[in-house]
């Protein structure tokens, strides 16, 4: 079975400046999968924001501007990434990683 | 609500090339992700390429890798598909696509907000 693991405990960034989050995935190959980002603001549910498929397919939530969030994922490390751009106030949050396996 | 429009279809010889465009009106275009299908007679409706929102990533179906390169210009709000080394089984109408929330070749049709009225190609000697 997969597991992930989001080394970085927290991030600080300076507004407007971009936020880099990242996200191991073990125990399976990252290629296979389907990463999914998620957020949590202070006090609000927990919202879906972008995923990266097995084929390579971005799938974002349609309400969040193009240009805010991007995904990617790197077999190499086995690592998924999480941009956030512009970096403003409403972006701090918790930023959680899920692993759907196909 | 957004508006396609494709040109650049005809009549080529196999081996030849044509560049589709695809304009779009009536939102902001850098919103949508773009993608290029096509459709023979009796057919599905088969996905060929994809460009992202920002066109940093691009996709491309097995059958048209390496012969077809797709691009946009979010200045002039149009999506293009270069297509070279064209072949009789090329032979469609194509459409572009737009959707606001999926960006690749696992996109369901119904995961795509708008489309074009298409334009037909024609490989033939």
């Known amino acids: 079975a997969g597991h992930l693991e989001q080394p970085q405990i927290s991030s600080t960034k300076t507004l407007s400046k971009t936020a880099r989050l990242e996200c191991v995935v073990s125990g399976i190959t990252i290629s296979a999968t389907s990463v999914y980002w998620y957020r949590e603001r202070p006090g609000e549910v927990i919202q879906f924001l972008v995923s990266i498929s097995y084929d390579g397919t971005v799938r974002k939530e349609s309400g969040i501007p193009s240009g805010k969030f991007e995904v990617d994922r790197i077999p190499e490390t086995s690592t998924s990434t999480l941009t956030i751009h512009n970096v403003e106030k409403q972006d701090i949050a918790t930023y959680y990683c899920a692993l759907w396996e196909v | 609500e957004v508006q396609l429009v494709e040109s650049g279809g005809g009549l080529v010889q196999p081996g030849g090339s044509l560049r589709l465009s695809c304009a779009a009106s009536?939102?902001?275009?850098?919103?949508?992700?773009m993608a290029w299908f096509r459709q023979a007679p009796e057919k599905e409706r088969d996905f060929l390429a994809a460009?992202?929102?920002?066109?940093?990533?691009?996709y491309y179906a097995d059958s048209v890798k390496g012969r077809f390169t797709i691009s946009r210009d979010n200045a002039k709000n149009t999506v293009n598909l270069q297509m070279n080394s064209l072949k009789p089984e090329d032979t469609a109408v194509y459409y572009c696509?737009?959707?606001?929330?999926?960006?690749?070749?696992?996109?369901?049709?119904?995961?795509?907000?708008?489309w074009g009225q298409g334009t037909q190609v024609t490989v033939s000697s």
């Open positions: 696509a737009a959707s606001l929330s999926c960006s690749g070749p696992g996109c369901s049709l119904e995961e795509y907000d708008y």
């Open positions: 009536g939102s902001i275009f850098s919103n949508y992700a």
């Open positions: 460009v992202s929102w920002s066109g940093g990533r691009t």
